[in-house]
Amino acid sequence: IWELKKDVYVVELDWYPDAPGEMVVLTCDTPEEDGITWTLDQSSEVLGSGKTLTIQVKEFGDAGQYTCHKGGEVLSHSLLLLHKKEDGIWSTDILKDQKEPKNKTFLRCEAKNYSGRFTCWWLTTISTDLTFSVKSSRGSSDPQGVTCGAATLSAERVRGDNKEYEYSVECQEDSACPAAEESLPIEVMVDAVHKLKYENYTSSFFIRDIIKPDPPKNLQLKPLKNSRQVEVSWEYPDTWSTPHSYFSLTFCVQVQGKSKREKKDRVFTDKTSATVICRKNASISVRAQDRYYSSSWSEWASVPCS
Amino acid sequence: RNLPVATPDPGMFPCLHHSQNLLRAVSNMLQKARQTLEFYPCTSEEIDHEDITKDKTSTVEACLPLELTKNESCLNSRETSFITNGSCLASRKTSFMMALCLSSIYEDLKMYQVEFKTMNAKLLMDPKRQIFLDQNMLAVIDELMQALNFNSETVPQKSSLEEPDFYKTKIKLCILLHAFRIRAVTIDRVMSYLNAS
């Protein structure tokens, strides 16, 4: 058993049929010694008396809010949560496996630049009685500070018969140099509590590996005289690290119709303009990627050919 | 320590081409190592990230773009003295700061070159003959060093009398390649910045 936060404790249980469970001793936070009784949740049934209560925690029915009282007055609470371990593996029931970039990916994180600011998100089908808390650091043995905000519900989607909820959190490394060469990864830890179930999820990464620039901005087309070619120009996104001559991007320019199966024109360039063949009912799209360290491409920025 | 903006005339920057070749060569070598040593811990997640130049050179700080010198997190620079007679910029306007940056890059390359050559000598003794260093990568390191054209003491190649542990050598190769790739990215950024200034 360990303390998650004040008056909230996590009991780690090996979860299998007829498991013996864990013996837990609760102590009432009071100077009083006599006349103390214990109850669980809203029940008025007295579970025991005395300053300490010993219980055998085996299942969710044994978890919950234990309260010690004296003469009708509440002295203190202890909330017990369960953390299940099945076949030596901690349960991951609360969050959905996003399977990208590999299986057992519950947390996904992205950074728009090298400033040390990043966003992580996760998915769940649970809509109520759900809380998250996020901690992060650079390195684990001698951790350096990363400050994370509160996790918020950022999107709701319908997937077949189920509703899916996306939560996200923004974090900022306390003293980040965009030009630094990372040798210690960022660690992100998410505590998830659903009703009386506790789970924790972690992710470890270098900012350089989760870079995904914003799409290029200000796409403009200039038809070339006596030609079917069009000069398309754009600018670096505002959110990208500066100076751009140091933090350079490379671009992919594509002309395609509405269907992905349609024919296309595609060219890669390090410049902020390119010449392509425009077709009726097609769009010109441009996306960006770090020129020197190939992490993710940005989303497309698009303009119609016409 | 930072790069001032007053720099060379356009087209006078032969190092940019060499640095691009360097990044390409080390990336290819790292990819080859990951594929060949698939049953060794050779991915970014599996290895310890060591920097053999730590406390010996300070390329990131010495080559910091002027725009980032206002960022206090970038300025915990280590004091290191460097030779300052580089010819890569082919311009008399080469400032002291820039020479410091380029000589730091030169020292990085020299240290990695020695490590890689020592390691290759060990790998050539491996009866499995599983992996060797790409001669192209070694040649590209040499070309960039020549373009930088700093005079510095030659570091003797480390020779070891004991029987090499090939497993450890291959893991060290992965660690070195990952670190060198990251440094090659920095070098490419620096050269691009100087070329544009």
């Epitope: 024919k263 360039t269 009726k280 | -």
Partner: antibody, heavy 118, light 107 residues
């Protein structure tokens, strides 16, 4: 299976014209860009131009501009390349080729040898 | 026009040995570079597109690398069926241009 079948070999006199055909099968004709590339005996590949059969748009290499005409007939899934004012150095194998991507080629015809000789 | 220069023009290789062909562009072309194989009396066949992207059905011993002006096609272990002429082609701008070809011959 996408296939491009070209017309047979031709022998032409200098100053005349040649029209080579290329019939496509497998896939929708207008879903692909069609290119013409030639190869002189023992020499390398030389790109001549492309056509978008959907709208008839064409682009020619400056070297052939004014001498080459590429057309397409959607109803028969056939493309044509006509080269005029032939000279002996136009002796080559002419390939039609296609791809959904405009700038490189993934399916080639078998080639048509055009010999220009007096 | 962008001029593509291949080297060497002839490459004698022992079967089972690796081979590398270089292609240089007269100006920077990013990764707009494609490789083809041509055997005598046959049409060319696409091997690699956009410098390093492999084609399904092409053996994994063929790999491409490079960007900017310098590109390499590598065959990790030459098989008897790989003896052919190899061409690079740039697609950075029109007109599309090819290298002059490299003939890989049995040593």
């Amino acid at each position: 299976q996408v296939q491009l079948v070209q017309s047979g070999a031709e022998v032409k006199k200098p100053g005349s014209s040649v029209k080579v055909s290329c019939k496509a099968s497998g896939g929708t004709f207008s879903d692909y860009y069609l290119h013409w590339v030639r190869q002189a005996p023992g020499q390398g590949l030389e790109w001549m131009g492309w056509i978008d059969p959907e709208n008839g748009d064409t682009e020619y290499a400056p070297k052939f501009q004014g001498r080459v005409t590429i057309t397409a007939d959607e109803s028969t899934s056939t493309a044509y390349m006509e080269l005029s004012s032939l000279r002996s150095e136009d002796t080559a194998v002419y390939y039609c080729a296609r791809n959904k991507e405009l700038r490189y080629i993934d399916v080639w015809g078998q080639g048509t040898l055009v010999t220009v000789s007096s | 026009d962008i001029v593509m220069t291949q080297s060497p023009l002839s490459l004698p290789v022992t079967p089972g040995e690796p081979a590398s062909i270089s292609c240089r562009a007269s100006q920077s072309i990013s990764i707009n570079l494609h490789w083809y194989q041509q055997k005598p009396g046959q049409a060319p066949r696409l091997l690699i597109y956009f410098a390093s992207q492999s084609i399904s059905g092409v053996p994994s011993r063929f790999s491409g690398s490079g960007s900017g002006t310098d590109f390499t096609l590598t065959i990790s272990s030459l098989q008897p069926e790989d003896f052919a002429t190899y061409y690079c082609q740039q697609s950075n701008s029109f007109p599309l241009t090819f290298g002059q070809g490299t003939k890989v011959e049995i040593k």
